[in-house]
């Protein structure tokens, strides 16, 4: 009658939606040699087997091509390769060694594979800093993909200036060229297995390293509301006495270090305020002139100055000789 | 003990027919596939025809298709080979063998001779 | 019709020497290979099935490896009783095929 072998190994098997799994199988080590003939996994139930090697019998449509017969009589592996897993494989397997010229065969026992949602998800790679105007190659990897699967398709989604480079079976590689204005934007990567008809996808923000592209100052005059300037002012008119605070604000990342100074300052000047802020509490003759905003950053300094005028007041200074 | 017995062997004229037989003891002959195999003097070894155990598959070697005919009685543990047409290059000990796709046991064969 | 090819198709060698014999098919047939060894005036004998796999009862100085179209048959000792005539045979399709022989002499 048929002779029956067990299984070694797992009673179930789990594989996600997409990806590879090896049922293991070991032939008998007592096998008649008239016994010894094509290998058949079949479908629990199905007369059609999904994997043979018997060049003479068709398989199940929907697994051929993925469901492969690793065959190696001397090592005894009668094991069933599976790739792009769909959730319609989800049932349980047994292999059958026979001949059709013999009566019987050697039947395994019952194997169930359990096809699961696939929750891993890209990776997404960035050697070192971003910057602004540089070359950088970022890597989308799906390192969980099996090299015998249907390769993945690699999708890229991101407003910066990009060109594809090599991919492999498990990794795509994206070539960007980022602009400050693309710092804080979203960079996508999306990865779908066509032999399962499954896509995943990975969203990262960009953290581009910029040099200030813009500088201004914002003045407060007492109570009165505040005013910007953008550019390089030759003349702001004060009144003497009046509370004055300047406010330095620049782009540029990681942030500017911003600093103050009176005059046109040289490179190594000290700064009068290490900060964006400059409070002049009562202006007067000594804050008549220029002060200027320094925006110091590793890829570059920016500077925007103004130049106070100072009002007098009409009883204002002592008269002279 | 597992044995095959081939019988029917002779001297037989260009164009005439033989029939050979195999009788089988020692085994459960309608689990196993049955084959036979020739062997010209002199020469190597021809595979002639093969028979499945329930008589589902048969296949037959180029040279000998569309005038031998291999069948099997299970129920008198007997393979034969009906030898149609038969000519002088068919002269050759006939071996009656079991197996799959392996031949694993051969028996003592009988020598066929077509001459005129 | 797959065509199976051996080589040597003779050789000569002494008790005690390594011996090897090929074996080529026309096209690919996995491991559905097997070897035979004949002695004149008796019947052949299985001696490995599946390309690599020993028969029982058979000494273990006989083995056999390879898959696809390339086959060898090692006799890793040889013994008087070993001087013979050694087939191979392919089972992957119908019609099957012996290789054309090879004969092993005493030198």
């Known amino acids: 009658q048929e002779r029956r072998f067990q299984l070694e190994g797992p009673e179930s098997l789990t594989v996600q939606e997409g990806l590879c799994v090896l049922v293991p199988c070991r032939l008998p080590t007592t096998l008649p040699a008239s016994y010894y003939g094509y290998g058949y996994w079949f479908l629990e139930g199905a007369d059609v087997p999904v994997a043979t090697n018997d060049p003479d019998e068709e398989v199940q449509e929907e697994t051929r091509g993925r469901f492969h017969l690793l065959w190696d009589p001397r090592r005894k592996n009668c094991s069933l390769s599976i790739r792009d897993a769909r959730r319609r494989d989800n049932a349980a397997y047994f292999f059958r060694l026979k001949s059709k010229w013999m009566k019987y065969g050697y039947t395994s026992s019952k194997l169930s594979v359990r096809v699961m949602a696939l929750t891993h998800r890209p990776n997404i790679s960035i050697p070192g800093t971003l910057e602004s105007g540089h070359p950088s190659n970022l890597t989308c990897s799906v390192p969980w993909v099996c090299e015998q699967g249907t390769p993945p398709i690699f999708s890229w989604m991101s407003a910066a200036p990009t060109s594809l480079g090599p991919r492999t079976t498990q990794s795509s590689v994206l070539t960007i060229t980022p602009r400050p204005q693309d710092h804080s934007t979203n960079l996508t990567c999306q990865v779908t297995f066509p032999g399962a008809g499954v896509t995943m996808e990975r969203t990262i923000q960009l953290n581009v390293s910029y040099a200030p592209q813009k500088v201004a100052i914002s003045i407060f005059q007492g109570n009165s509301a505040a005013f910007k300037i953008l550019q390089n002012t030759s003349s702001l008119p004060v009144l003497e006495g009046q509370a004055l605070r300047l406010l330095c604000d620049a782009d540029g990342n990681p942030p500017a270090h911003l600093s103050w100074f009176q005059g046109f300052p040289a490179l190594n000047a000290t700064p009068i305020s290490n900060t964006g802020v400059l409070e002049l509490p009562q202006v007067g003759s000594a804050e008549e002139g220029d002060f200027t905003c320094r925006a110091q950053h590793p890829l570059g300094s920016l500077q925007i100055s103004l130049s106070l005028f100072v009002h007098w007041k009409p009883e204002g200074r002592a008269g002279g000789v | 003990k597992v044995q095959l017995l081939e019988s029917g062997g002779g001297l037989v004229q260009p164009g005439r027919s033989l029939r050979l037989s195999c009788a089988a003891s020692g085994f459960t002959f309608d689990d196993y596939g049955m084959h036979w195999v020739r062997q010209a003097p002199g020469k190597g070894l021809e595979w002639v025809s093969g028979i499945s155990w329930n008589s589902g598959s048969i296949g037959y070697a180029d040279s000998v298709k569309g005038r031998f005919t291999i069948s099997r009685d299970n129920s008198k543990n007997t393979l034969y080979l009906q030898m149609n047409s038969l000519r002088a290059e068919d002269t050759a000990v006939y071996y009656c063998?079991?197996?799959?796709?392996?031949?694993?046991?051969w028996g003592q064969g009988t020598m066929v001779t077509v001459s005129s | 019709d797959i065509q199976m090819t051996q080589s040597p198709s003779s050789l000569s060698a002494s008790v005690g020497d390594r011996v090897t014999i090929t074996c080529r098919a026309s096209?690919?047939?996995?491991?559905?290979l097997n070897w035979y060894q004949q002695k004149p005036g008796k019947a052949p004998k299985l001696l490995i099935y599946?390309?690599?796999s020993l028969q029982s009862g058979v000494p273990s100085r006989f083995s056999g490896s390879g898959s696809g179209t390339d086959f060898t048959l090692t006799i890793s000792s040889l013994q008087p009783e070993d001087f013979a005539t050694y087939y191979c045979?392919?089972?992957?399709?119908?019609?099957?095929?012996f290789g054309p022989g090879t004969k092993v002499d005493i030198k």
């Open positions: 096209q690919s047939i996995s491991s559905y």
């Open positions: 063998a079991r197996g799959g796709q392996t031949i694993d046991i």
């Open positions: 045979q392919q089972s992957y399709s119908t019609p099957f095929t």
């Open positions: 599946a390309a690599s």
